[in-house]
């Protein structure tokens, strides 16, 4: 019987692999290399979105396209080969940080070159898997010392993205110390990211189980045929009925004119490491993409002048000398947006249980989406956080962090 | 009722710089995506560009004839949206027109002010 | 940029004929596309938005269909009212863009 691989399918130095087909016969699998997809990987990666990056391993959007941002001493598309290896090596060994949820890596002579070891509860080439255990009363303890040292650096150290070490004292998940604190059912941040109806966990507290008992046959995330129309065309003051779905964003409310605001409590306050005027620029696009992550309506608080609330954020000063302040203006490093959500459309969709009722539940929910490696969001982000309403503060305040 | 009133056009010399106005009345303007379109004379429409609402960041588009050279602002508590427009060329020569965009096309447009550009 | 077509440039119609006037994009703008008529003098006025949907106000007697990269303004009768010049205009990206317009003068 001739291989399904032996016509060679796989395109773009895709490695093929046999595979169950329908009614029992063969099929193939392609994968890809980076940064190519698709079932015979015959597309490219356009976005962050399409591009998988080894797990650890951030992706960046960059002029010539989505890449992966190889830790040091790993290079090519998938950071799988050293500098210098030949072409198909693939030595994704432990720089890459394969392994989640705590679990320690270990390299390994064959391919992949590495092996994982899993912390309690975990299971997978991985550890990406919960393991089926009994409920447990609370969360163990953090299992590394040296985690107590990296909590807090501003970078996500993945051996100590766990409950148990505060995912890495909140490095991994924008700030916000425990997404899920709110949640009673203690699993719930296991179940997250399984792409399976856990009704325990479908609560607005438990983060609605990440939309997981929503979903319902809808699509999760916008077709990437209609999103970068829908970023161009987003609050163009143009209904776009494509556009005006949850998973799009609902047009920046292009077809709401009529319908009366519905604001969420208080504000969402997001860092984003791109300078205001940067920011500014992609505005529509970094609204779009974001109200579609969390399938509500974000626009810009405004000030009492009408101005935008996108303040300079300014990198924090060691130690902090007001004489060095003085000496020399504060380089600014990003941006404190301050956003307004509008829930008219989320509470009037058919499915109208899963809107976020305050700012603080939905900077919980990105801080989520950041801890289990599932936040799809091309802007860098630093922090995130709720604010209660405080009146708007006039236009020439700048924020010194 | 809802209205648009362009204003500060005139004669300006090659190079020169000029300000338009638009005032806007009887709608709440802050919300509104505003455009600039414009018309040589004996021409026909050319769009010249657009401003956001401020809520969505206030960006601006612009057609590649003005890029760079002209620049479209607001200013939510006047109820005004400008068109500053520098290093004039005498094909700027036009009748220039501010519109509102409405997502269910109810368009709203001024009378439009003439800008003449010449030596 | 998408380009706009339009055709013809110029027509001589009497009061009661109809009157087609066609517009071409230069790429796909599905159903974009937006007809103004415009009298001398004055400022534009939107006679169908999305290719196909009359403007409140608008007289029946006007109608549009096409989509992609095909439109067609349609007056059913011309009435004296109608001799002015037309315009389409796209809005699926910018820079949006207009036709060069199509006059109809009265035979």
């Known amino acids: 019987v001739l291989s399904p691989c032996e016509s060679q399918p796989c395109q773009h130095g895709g490695q093929c692999r046999p595979s169950p087909g329908p009614g029992g016969g063969l099929t193939f699998t392609c994968h890809c290399a980076q940064p190519f997809w698709g079932p015979r990987c015959e597309r490219v990666a356009r976005s962050c979105r399409e591009l998988q990056c080894p797990v650890g391993v951030p992706c960046q959007q960059t002029p010539r396209g989505p890449r992966c941002a190889c830790p040091p001493g790993l290079s090519g598309p998938s950071c799988r080969s050293f500098p210098g290896s030949p072409p198909g090596a693939s030595n994704a060994s432990c720089a890459a940080a394969p392994c989640l949820h705590g679990g320690s890596c270990r390299p390994a002579p064959l391919a992949p070159f590495f092996r994982c070891a899993c912390a309690q509860g975990w299971t997978g080439p991985r550890c990406e898997a919960p393991a089926a255990a009994p409920e447990v009363s609370e969360e163990p303890r953090c299992p590394r010392a040296a985690c107590q040292a990296k909590r807090g650096d501003q970078r996500c150290d993945r051996e100590c993205n766990s409950p148990g070490c505060g995912w890495d004292g909140g490095d991994c998940s924008l700030s916000v110390g425990d997404p899920w604190r709110q949640c009673e059912a203690l699993q719930c941040w296991r179940l997250f990211n399984n792409s399976r109806c856990d009704p325990a966990c479908s609560s607005p507290a438990c983060l609605y189980d990440n939309f997981d008992c929503h979903a319902g046959g809808r699509e999760r995330t916008c077709n990437p045929v209609y999103e970068k129309y829908c970023a161009d065309h987003f609050a163009d003051g143009r209904c776009d009925q494509g556009c005006n779905t949850e998973e799009c964003g609902w047009d920046g409310l292009d077809c709401a004119s009529e319908v009366p605001a519905l604001l969420a409590r208080g504000v969402l306050v997001l860092t984003v490491l791109l300078p205001p005027e940067e920011l500014l620029r992609s505005s529509a696009d970094f609204l779009q993409r974001l109200s579609a992550i969390l399938r509500t309506s974000l626009r810009f608080r405004l000030d009492a002048h009408g101005q935008a609330m996108v303040f300079p954020y300014h990198r924090p000063s060691p130690g902090s000398e007001p004489r060095a302040r003085r000496e020399l203006a504060p380089e600014v490093i990003g941006s404190v947006v301050m956003l307004e959500i509008d829930n008219r459309l989320c509470l009037q969709s058919p499915e109208n249980d899963h809107c976020f009722p305050d700012a603080q539940s939905a900077a919980d929910y990105l801080g989520a989406l950041s801890a289990v490696e599932r936040l799809d969001f091309p802007y860098p982000l630093r922090d995130v956080r709720g604010e209660p309403l405080e009146p708007p503060e006039p236009s020439h305040h700048h924020h010194h962090h | 009722q809802v209205q648009l009133v362009e204003s500060g056009g005139g004669l300006v010399k090659p190079g020169g710089s000029l300000r338009l106005s638009c005032a806007a009345s009887g709608f709440t303007f802050s919300t509104y995506v505003m455009h600039w379109v414009r018309q040589a004379p004996g021409k026909g429409l050319e769009w010249v560009g657009r401003i956001r609402a401020n809520a969505y960041g206030g960006a601006a588009d612009y057609a590649a004839p003005v890029k760079g050279r002209f620049t479209i602002s607001r200013d939510d508590s006047k109820n005004t949206l400008y068109l500053q427009m520098n290093s004039l060329k005498t094909e700027d020569t036009a009748v220039y027109y501010c519109a509102r965009a409405e997502a269910r096309y109810r368009d709203v447009w001024g009378q439009g002010t003439l800008v003449t550009v010449s030596s | 940029d998408i380009q706009m077509t339009q055709s013809p440039s110029s027509l001589s119609a009497s009061v009661g004929d109809r009157v087609t006037i066609t517009c071409r994009a230069s790429q796909s703008i599905s159903s974009h596309l937006n007809w103004y008529q415009q009298k001398p003098g004055k400022a534009p006025k939107l006679l169908i938005y999305?290719?196909?949907n009359l403007q409140s106000g608008v007289p029946s007697r006007f109608s549009g269909s096409g989509s992609g990269t095909d439109f067609t303004l349609t007056i059913s009768s011309l009435q004296p009212e109608d001799f002015a010049t037309y315009y389409c205009?796209?809005?699926?990206?910018?820079?949006?863009?207009f036709g060069q317009g199509t006059k109809v003068e009265i035979k």
């Open positions: 205009q796209q809005d699926y990206h910018t820079p949006f863009t």
């Open positions: 999305a290719a196909s």
